[in-house]
């Protein structure tokens, strides 16, 4: 049988022989030389050779473990004369040895990580890996321990897992933001003689909200004139965040000051500034400076940062308005005034006000705008207002009159205003009452005495306040011995009635009655109409046949039938 | 980096309806106020209608071309603008753009084309 | 609201100034911003309130804005600076943003 243990080589072998491995041996070989050794399988012949007689094995060339680290070949031992085996063909395994000849390699050459700003001692950054292409299941070859060469006090590296935390307290991005730390994995343990390799991680802090904003001044002073329409910028102001992104959001607003309400503060993302803004018309006379308190607080806070104090602060604007030269102002935004119609040419109506707003106080003189009293019907007194008549009215005419006045400085005659002047006509008695048409009637030969032929009515130009009031009667020239009588239906109409049974077309075919129409206003007013009554043929039913006249057309009046 | 990306464009028949969405990236989408601009072909830039911010009350103002028609709208959560476009015209054609700001429009998205034809 | 005018175009040497204005109702008292659009090209922000420049904004960039004219001024104009031009403004009222017709500026050469 066989006789050999296991063959172990040691890697890397740098003597200048070849390197022995083992021997090869049967308990069949007596030692004459009858046997010969042949050696087949991994290397063999190349790598490995072997003494035919005698068994013996060497190395011919340096081996890696690392490369390759074992070797299986086969051997035979076989009877030089007969050529047959005298031991079975048997495998066997060549080991190679490790030494520490590598070094750890990092994973990465260089790693990227990025922990909070202020975080805790402990906190974790990132984990490095080393590998060691050593045997690690013999010695400390492989046996990789990590420590940091470069980043302390900031940062520390745990000797066994390669897990880098933050060593010190409150590091502060907003005073440095990126370190770079290396890392060294050394192998043996960490031991005197072991091999070792770096990586560089490079270490971002990344920002957490621990700063409030801060205004770069107390104080902020803007001019805006007191035209300034609502919604008109007037300044920006802006306050600084060491913070980045979204932990240097700032949002504004007016918390205070007597501005509050005339005043807006509108934050734009774009830039973090706050743009103070008109909010109420101005009025320099009024109040010439504004002072506002103006905030400027973060939207996003940690609340473990709260202890550092408010995440806001604030600033004093101060606005001045500037005056800018405005036209007269009236007193009243429209004037009604009223005047009687029969008041005679310069009567006074009323007056209007107004006033130069500026601090100046500039003297005001009046007008009327002649394209709004193209008849010059009314004037103004220049200095103080007065509006007067220039000519007659009459209510019947045009009951409002609707005129303009203009303010003008008289410094600066560009600053004029306007306003409308309704003025109304008061009615007055001035005219007659009169029929409201022309009537012609007529009458039946064979009619009825207190017959009714006609019903009158009349109008009046005028608007009594009471309403109209009218009374009629017959004119006293024609009272006694007429044919008709008049009969006031107290209503403002009035009816017409036969006298007597029967007239004579032939003996008159045309009565004139004289009517005559008071109203009941002061002073009173009166007219006299004429009703002219023809005398006609007419059938037993009362239809009208014929008339000494001309047949009447359309005639007026009620049908004396009945 | 802070970017917008529209969609939605093509062809759409007068009277038809078509809906345009604008994602935005790189920034905190929900506190900024975000337009719509469009621009015929060969024409000018002309304001479509923009949308506040939630924190200035998400309220929504158009050009009179476009008002009764076109509706704004916002999914913070999504961090996506929409513009519904309804009862569409032949004028209506033009690259529609999303931006950001109030005051000044400082980001564009690179445009969307709705074509609008029979 | 307001109405904002520029002229439909502007041509300059290379090197020169360039000017373009924007007229509007007493413009002056809003703000002005000015964009910068390449063909097939979004707009691009280059003057805000006024006069700020964002950043990457080449300084040769600059605006004014005072009574009824608002102003873009490019010194030393460069070939690349060849685009449309629109001016907006914002007063903090009005509800809807207004840009101007929009100015062709042409290098020549």
């Known amino acids: 049988s066989w006789m050999w243990n296991q063959f172990f080589l040691l890697e890397e072998y740098t003597g200048s022989d070849y390197q022995y491995v083992g021997k090869l041996h049967s308990d069949q070989d007596r030692g004459d030389g009858s046997l010969k050794y042949i050696l087949s399988g991994d290397g063999a012949g190349d790598l490995f050779i072997i003494n035919e007689n005698t068994g013996d094995i060497q190395a011919t060339k340096r081996l890696d473990r690392e490369e390759k680290p074992v070797y299986i070949l086969r051997a035979q031992a076989i009877n030089r004369r007969t050529g047959r085996p005298v031991e079975p063909e048997s495998e066997f395994i060549i080991k190679i040895h490790d030494i520490n000849d590598n070094e750890p390699i990092f994973t990465k050459e260089v790693y990227t990580a990025t922990v909070p700003e202020m975080s805790d001692v402990g906190t974790f950054v990132v984990q490095v890996t080393a590998t060691d292409a050593d045997d690690p299941t013999y010695g400390n070859s492989a046996k990789v321990v990590y420590s940091i060469l470069q980043g302390q006090p900031y940062f520390s590296v745990e000797s066994e897992t390669g897990i880098i935390k933050t060593a010190l307290l409150n590091m502060d991005r907003e005073n440095r933001e990126q370190y770079q730390v290396v890392i060294q994995a050394k192998d043996m343990g960490g031991q005197m003689g072991g091999l070792s390799g770096t990586t560089t991680v490079n270490i971002t802090l990344t920002d957490v909200n621990d700063n409030p904003p801060r205004f770069p001044q107390s104080t902020y002073q803007f001019k805006t004139p007191e035209s300034s329409p609502p919604g008109t910028p007037i300044g920006r102001i802006k306050a600084s965040d060491a913070d980045v992104g979204e932990n240097a959001e700032i949002e504004y607003s007016i918390t205070d000051g007597e501005g509050l309400d005339m005043f807006d503060v509108i934050t734009d993302q774009e830039t973090q500034e706050g743009i103070i803004t008109v909010k109420k018309l101005l009025d320099f006379e009024k109040k010439k400076v504004y002072t506002l308190k103006v905030e400027a607080s973060n939207p996003h806070v940690e609340p473990r940062f709260l202890y550092l104090g408010p995440f806001k602060d604030s600033a004093t604007v101060r606005i001045v308005v500037e005056d800018v030269d405005e036209p007269p102002v009236f007193s009243k935004l429209a004037y009604i005034l009223q005047i009687r119609e029969d008041a005679q040419i310069n009567t006074t109506i009323g007056s209007v006000t107004a006033q130069d707003p500026d601090a100046a106080r500039n003297p005001v003189k009046y007008s009327v705008d002649r394209h709004t009293d193209m008849d010059r019907i009314f004037n103004i007194d220049s200095g103080n207002g007065s509006i007067f008549t220039s000519k007659l009215l009459d209510r019947e005419t045009l009951l409002w009159h609707n005129i303009t006045v203009i303010a003008t400085e008289i410094n600066n005659p560009k600053q004029s205003s306007r306003v409308p002047l309704y003025i109304k006509v008061l009615d007055v008695n001035d005219n007659a009452p009169e029929f409201a048409e022309f009537y012609e009637t007529f009458v039946c030969e064979k009619a009825k005495a207190d017959q009714l032929i006609q019903t009158l009515r009349a109008v009046d130009k005028d608007d009594p306040y009471s309403g109209h009031q009218f009374s009629f009667s017959l004119a006293p020239e024609a009272a006694s011995g007429s044919n008709f009588t008049i009969q006031d239906n107290k209503d403002n109409t009035a009816g017409i009635l036969t006298r007597k049974n029967g007239y004579n077309r032939h003996e008159m075919s045309t009565y004139l009655l004289p009517v005559v129409i008071s109203d009941n206003d002061y002073p009173v007013q009166s007219s006299t109409g004429t009703v002219t009554v023809r005398v006609c043929a007419c059938d037993h039913h009362g239809n009208m046949q014929s008339c000494h006249a001309e047949a009447l057309i359309h005639p007026t009046g009620l049908s004396t039938g009945a | 980096q802070v970017q917008l990306v529209e969609s939605g464009g093509g062809l759409v028949k007068p009277g038809g309806s078509l809906r345009l969405s604008c994602a935005a990236s790189?920034?905190?989408?929900?506190?900024?106020?975000m337009d719509w601009v469009r621009q015929a072909p060969g024409k000018g830039l002309e304001w479509v209608g923009r949308?506040?911010?939630?924190?200035?009350?998400?309220?929504?103002d158009y050009a009179a071309p476009v008002k009764g028609r076109f509706t704004i709208s916002r999914d913070d959560s999504k961090n996506t603008l929409y513009l519904q476009m309804n009862s569409l015209k032949t004028e209506d054609t033009a690259v529609y753009y999303c931006?950001?700001?109030?005051?000044?429009?400082?980001?564009w998205g690179q445009g969307t084309l709705v074509t609008v034809s029979s | 609201d307001i109405e904002l005018t520029q002229p439909p175009s502007v041509s300059v040497s290379p090197g020169q100034t360039a000017s373009i204005t924007c007229s509007g109702d007493?413009?002056?008292?809003?703000?002005a911003q000015w964009y910068q659009q390449k063909p097939g090209q979004a707009p691009v922000l280059v003057i805000y309130?006024?006069?700020e420049r964002p950043s990457g904004i080449p300084e040769r960039f600059s605006g004014s804005n005072s009574g009824n004219t608002a102003t873009l001024t490019i010194s030393g104009t460069q070939a690349e600076d060849e685009a449309d031009y629109y001016c907006?403004?914002?007063?903090?009222?009005?509800?809807?943003?207004?840009f101007g017709g929009g100015t062709k500026l042409t290098v020549l050469g």
């Open positions: 949308i506040k911010s939630k924190a200035n009350g998400g309220i929504t």
């Open positions: 007493s413009i002056g008292s809003k703000y």
């Open positions: 309130y006024n006069s």
């Open positions: 790189g920034f905190t989408f929900s506190r900024y106020w």
């Open positions: 931006a950001r700001g109030m005051t000044f429009l400082g980001i």
């Open positions: 907006q403004s914002w007063d903090g009222q009005s509800t809807i943003r207004v």
